[in-house]
Amino acid sequence: GGTAEKWEETELDQLFSGPLPGRLPVNHRPFSAPHSSRDQLPPPQTGRSHPAHTAAPQVTSTASKLLPPVAFNHTIGHIVLSEHKNVKFNCSINIPNTYQETAGISWWKDGKELLGAHHSITQFYPDEEGVSIIALFSIASVQRSDNGSYFCKMKVNNREIVSDPIYVEVQGLPYFIKQPESVNVTRNTAFNLTCQAVGPPEPVNIFWVQNSSRVNEKPERSPSVLTVPGLTETAVFSCEAHNDKGLTVSKGVHINIKVIPSPPTEVHILNSTAHSILVSWVPGFDGYSPLQNCSIQVKEADRLSNGSVMVFNTSASPHLYEIQQLQALANYSIAVSCRNEIGWSAVSPWILASTTEGAPSVAPLNITVFLNESNNILDIRWTKPPIKRQDGELVGYRISHVWESAGTYKELSEEVSQNGSWAQIPVQIHNATCTVRIAAITKGGIGPFSEPVNIIIPEHSKVDYAPSSTPAPGNTDSM
């Protein structure tokens, strides 16, 4: 029970009405540190008129029917106060002597018992008719979290008695539960911002501010959604929330206009081979919109080239791409551009890069293999392949010779210098087939092997040979 009141920093004396009896011996039993320095407190109404109360226990035993009903006395029902103020309130009850078993008073808030170091204190005032008990509760510097419904509980003769609630309403400035958020928007495209603040006290009204100017001279009830029809340049938005306690201001948020990205910077060549270049770059400013992909533009730097540009597309991340299928020993100009949803950036500054010399693209020609039986060697001859400038400078040849006979297989290779176009290889196995292939070598690597040339190595003097670089499936000529 109790009536709603506006009550801040109420002193204990104000909580009680009615005449005060003479001082009685007091059993002072605090549940935690007492909030008051006084050892004696005035009791509640002592006229012993027990109010009819819905919370009175239902007593059923024959003996109990003689007991008068017991209930908590009415107290203040609604306390309204500002944040950071102090508040004190109480429950009181008169227990006649006829009740033998009573337990302490416990405080509850919103259905949960308040345990631990709360500022509560219980005072007992005995007299010839029974005892008056006052449970006092105080909160220093109240916060919004102290809002709620407080009540007392007590067991009398094993029956639970509950007081009427005391509703504490802590009022303060509006409190933002949703502030506008930074967004990146397309130029001249509508977007929404949301602002929500709560009390108590309600209502909370919202004003929007754009670049230090109020958008609405009439406020909107919280929550408020501001629809901005479109922007052409970056703007800062915030909202003001007003209630009966004053005003608060949200954080200011930047609304950025999406633009094309800035060009990439720091384009570097990480590695070059004869036919590929590994390029890296640092993305430019993304224009307030995530980069989607990048384009690597490659053109031959030589004056004689026709100026056509090769374009290679790749994902925006990682900022790395291997350009392939390039000519060996060639000069290229390379630039990078990246795009977001608005469009492509300008290209980065062009940088020069070169591929290294390549491996030969053709195999040696006119391969002939002869068996020199007297020296037990193979005499191998060939013609130098036509090597282009970009294939690099010839440094030698690799000769692969495979020996096969019943139950035996031997795969060997020799490297010879570029001087001359012949080589001699000792016979490894008799009564066998020897397959010979030759590849040219430059600094750029090893070229393709020629087609295999087979020669049969007899047990004694009979020899078959294949005097050309075409495959020799069987005996082609004999010498």
């Epitope: 400035l173 006290p201 309600e202 209502p203 009204n205 004003f207 501010v209 230090s212 100017s213 109020r214 001279e217 009439k218 406020p219 009830r221 915030s238 003001e240 007003h242 209630n243 009966d244 306690k245 004053g246 005003l247 608060t248 201001v249």
Partner: antibody
Framework: QIQLVQSGPELKKPGETVKISCKAS????????MSWVKQAPGKNLKWMGW????????TYADDFKGRFAFSLETSATTAYLQINNLTNEDSATYFC??????????????WGQGTTLTVSS | DVVMTQTPLTLSVTIGQPASISCKSS???????????LNWLLQRPGQSPKRLMY???KLDSGVPDRFTGSGSGTDFTLKISRVEAEDLGVYYC?????????FGGGTKLEIK
């Protein structure tokens, strides 16, 4: 108790500039705004606009855009009204009033004592 | 701007007698939120204005209940049931529904 104390009377010549102060006490300065009201002799009270004491965002009534500027010195809990290029028509008493938007609308609940500006050549 | 017109300009009343001041607006002061932002101020001689009433009829704290406000739309009235000496001064109505806020010309209450 909230108090708004304004600076003393001003005598200025046309073309000059005046800056009137309004010192607030008794409440958190940044939790409300300050309105300015002009009371010219024999004329209606005229609302000039208001400034948010937290953010400094100002709103001006149309008749007071241009030569008039509201400002703050938050650390000194003081609001200012500056009028540039004074004319004879600026002669009036200027009031500051605490302001924000409550459940009953604009509050206008506490007023300064007023500052009398006389513009005369 | 909304024009607020007060009548009479001057009101001479004997102490203990009632008084009535009228305020008319050039546009309805009923806002889209259902509230009517019509307010009254009292400026006692040599003092700054003081809020008296808001939302047509709600008294500010400390204002005696002999003051009552009424009206709707564009017509509003402030009544004093029994004038006392402390009531003398200039009464202003003002509206906060439309931008900019505007004031009436004032009604001077003097004691006969």
């Amino acid at each position: 108790q909230i108090q708004l104390v304004q600076s003393g009377p001003e005598l200025k010549k046309p073309g000059e500039t005046v800056k009137i102060s309004c010192k607030a006490s008794g409440n958190t300065f940044t939790t409300y705004g300050m309105s300015w009201v002009k009371q010219a002799p024999g004329k209606n009270l005229k609302w000039m606009g208001w400034i948010n004491n937290y953010s400094g965002v100002s709103t001006y009534a149309d008749d007071f855009k241009g030569r008039f500027a509201f400002s703050l010195e938050t650390s000194a809990t003081t609001a200012y009204l500056q009028i540039n290029n004074l004319t004879n028509e600026d002669s009036a008493t200027y009031f500051c009033a605490r302001d924000y938007y409550g459940s009953g609308g604009w509050v206008f609940d506490y007023w300064g004592q007023g500052t009398t500006l006389t513009v005369s050549s | 701007d909304v024009v607020m017109t007060q009548t009479p300009l001057t009101l001479s009343v004997t102490i203990g007698q009632p008084a009535s001041i009228s305020c008319k607006s050039s546009q309805s002061l009923l806002d889209s939120d259902g509230k009517t932002y019509l307010n009254w101020l009292l400026q006692r001689p040599g003092q700054s204005p003081k809020r008296l009433m808001y939302l047509v009829s709600k008294l500010d704290s400390g204002v005696p209940d002999r003051f009552t406000g009424s009206g709707s739309g564009t017509d509003f009235t402030l009544k004093i049931s029994r004038v006392e000496a402390e009531d003398l001064g200039v009464y202003y109505c003002w509206q906060g529904t439309h931008f900019p806020r505007t004031f009436g010309g004032g009604t001077k209450l003097e004691i006969k």
